[in-house]
Interface confidence: low
Amino acid sequence: GCLTQLYENAFFRGGDVASMYTPNAQYCQMRCTFHPRCLLFSFLPASSINDMEKRFGCFLKDSVTGTLPKVHRTGAVSGHSLKQCGHQISACHRDIYKGVDMRGVNFNVSKVSSVEECQKRCTSNIRCQFFSYATQTFHKAEYRNNCLLKYSPGGTPTAIKVLSNVESGFSLKPCALSEIGCHMNIFQHLAFSDVDVARVLTPDAFVCRTICTYHPNCLFFTFYTNVWKIESQRNVCLLKTSESGTPSSSTPQENTISGYSLLTCKRTLPEPCHSKIYPGVDFGGEELNVTFVKGVNVCQETCTKMIRCQFFTYSLLPEDCKEEKCKCFLRLSMDGSPTRIAYGTQGSSGYSLRLCNTGDNSVCTTKTSTR
Amino acid sequence: IVGGTNSSWGEWPWQVSLQVKLTAQRHLCGGSLIGHQWVLTAAHCFDGLPLQDVWRIYSGILNLSDITKDTPFSQIKEIIIHQNYKVSEGNHDIALIKLQAPLNYTEFQKPICLPSKGDTSTIYTNCWVTGWGFSKEKGEIQNILQKVNIPLVTNEECQKRYQDYKITQRMVCAGYKEGGKDACKGDSGGPLVCKHNGMWRLVGITSWGEGCARREQPGVYTKVAEYMDWILEKTQSSDGKAQMQSPA
């Protein structure tokens, strides 16, 4: 279920899957929520530790049992991912942090009159992930009112420093507040060029697009269908970026599909989950559990309820069925995507709905009935 | 290092310069200080030069041009080349150097932590390669220690880029698809370090690559985690304590 409590002065020991710098525990929790394997996190505020390298450290953790031993650490904050928390799942983070400089690649500097204007500039720049603003009282006069737009390889700051009269924050693109707008078109038989930032396996271009939307550095993508000529590249979803923010070239290519991240859409973003079930498809991955259930929908529900489950395959092979129930294989991988996608199998596959924000399992929302 | 920038004092305090003094003296390879008396480097640095008395190891330095005849250096007590390394292949490109005298640690000269044995689960997102090597394919040794931030590439992706070589599980690759940033000649033996949980770890030893910083040709590094048993075995001192830095 959904666990929202935070543990003050506690640090989870072990289980690290990733680490990064974040300005506070809430942002760390959000990164944990969207990380494919993170179940728990621990955050070290600047006040909690003398080691400059570990200040603002956000440690994402996984555990086979869903829990880890807590050790006392003054000032540390720990908690759970919000993967099963329905309406609380959002990549939107509006906070502005005073007295903090979030470091990254500074790719644009301009003079603005307020931190809000700086955040708006970041939100309206295709490559900007976060920003820092030197206020009117910054100690070096030439830097005052400077708005620095930034990005980094992982989408989070490469370092965070305590610095007076500097204010920092994140792009509000995940809040659907970008003025850029987005391309909803999907381009059949077209491959985009430029830099690959990641490669995952997906069953279709729509899942590929959703993964691109929530990947910090993906601006557009190319998907190679299951009939692509090179067998090893079938179902490959290439997440891409470029200096300009758009593909520098595109090549007509049979059995490829390309499109853009929807992060810059106004008003609404796609849900960070994939609800479609794919008949005749087997998703390969690390086996989490195998259970007998009645029907593919129940298999998907079982996967959704088991927090570590990322995707599943429901087998209809006679040897995998007992009366009305068949084997439901609950699976996971390092990146949350299948490690292999096979076609022509007797069964169906799909994804956990743990990141769908329409769930009714939030402890912080009141469910209202429709009239 | 291609596409890199100047490092600053004490930024990479484990980086050492392996130099050969024959008729003239020149920098040949990098290396990483892993203990008071131990340096980890690439085996191929000793191809043709296995004589320990010709080598000079400079630690705690930033600028090679600052080296004079009075600059202190370490000498080699023992070169331990991995038993399975072959000159004709790229595999097991790892060597340990035991120094004649232990080094004191300072802000500018201290060891890098080693990864856990067989570390395959850690996802490293902040990795850097450093060295005084060429800044372009047909370049020359650089005076100031260079650094460059390079993402790790999966072995599967790396194998695709090097279809005529075997990329083994004991190698790790790093590079940008578009090229432009990479290690190069003279960086061999030096460190590929990644920051994880606020701690720098030695993930790779600069080994080889198709040219330098070419598109779709990542750099190939010896994966240190795969050689932890070997490192521990070789660095065990007589009192049974490992003379190197390993994360708690």
Epitope: - | G48, V87, S88
Partner: antibody, heavy 122, light 106 residues
């Protein structure tokens, strides 16, 4: 500047011996595979022999196997070709060469010396 | 041993012509093929390696293609400086050169 300078060529009688040298400068000689390539007058290029960076591995074309020996002295930055039992068909310009970049131990040659002429005649 | 066969052995062409030289390997060499240009009395000069990668400093009118056993060197618009002998070389297993193609003025 990178340079390869061959020497030791000359006129020799069939059955005789000759030792060619190639002095290298401007690069880290000990890092590279070195090669000898020859070209008979008016003919094409023929690879003769190669030596890996440490000197521990040597390879030869079938036409010279057992007669020629390649060696190197990394401390002197010098490559050698000891040619014994010379025949008329060994008459050629002999070039030393190496490839200065690329994957270790496997590449084309892009740095050549200017060559030294060996004439085998009675 | 891998044999390399070049064709034609001589090629007569004029300035501005598009020139194509082919090279065939006796067995697959993947992309491990280089092309050299040689002028009389001079050492060869590397133009292309790995079948299609242009060596730095070589004019873009030179291009290479092919893999496996069939390879091609193309000069898109022949210049006066391009009249020379061209060699292919495999480096998949040791090193073998083709017999050369002389490009002469028509």
């Amino acid at each position: 500047e990178v340079q390869l300078l061959e020497s030791g060529g000359g006129l020799v009688q069939p059955g005789g011996s000759l030792r060619l040298s190639c002095a290298a400068s401007g690069f880290t000689f000990s890092h590279y595979i070195m090669m000898w390539v020859r070209q008979a007058p008016g003919k094409g290029l023929e690879w003769v022999s190669g030596i890996y960076s440490s000197g521990g591995i040597t390879v030869y074309a079938d036409s010279v196997k057992g007669r020629f020996t390649i060696s190197r002295d990394n401390s002197k930055n010098t490559l050698y070709l000891q040619m014994n039992s010379l025949r008329a068909e060994d008459t050629a310009v002999y070039y030393c060469a190496y490839r200065r970049t690329g994957v270790p131990r496997r590449d084309a040659f892009d740095i050549w010396g200017q060559g030294t002429m060996v004439t085998v005649s009675s | 041993d891998i044999q390399m066969t070049q064709s034609p052995s001589t090629l007569s062409a004029s300035v501005g012509d598009r020139v194509t030289i082919t090279c065939r390997a006796s067995q697959s060499i993947s992309s491990w093929l280089a092309w050299y240009q040689q002028k009389p009395g001079k050492a060869p000069n590397l133009l292309i390696y790995k079948a299609s990668t242009l060596e730095s400093g070589v004019p873009s009118r030179f291009s290479g293609s092919g893999s496996g056993t069939e390879f091609t060197l193309t000069i898109s618009s022949l210049q006066p400086d391009d009249f020379a002998t061209y060699y292919c070389q495999q480096y998949n297993t040791y090193w073998t050169f083709g017999q050369g193609t002389k490009v002469e003025i028509k």
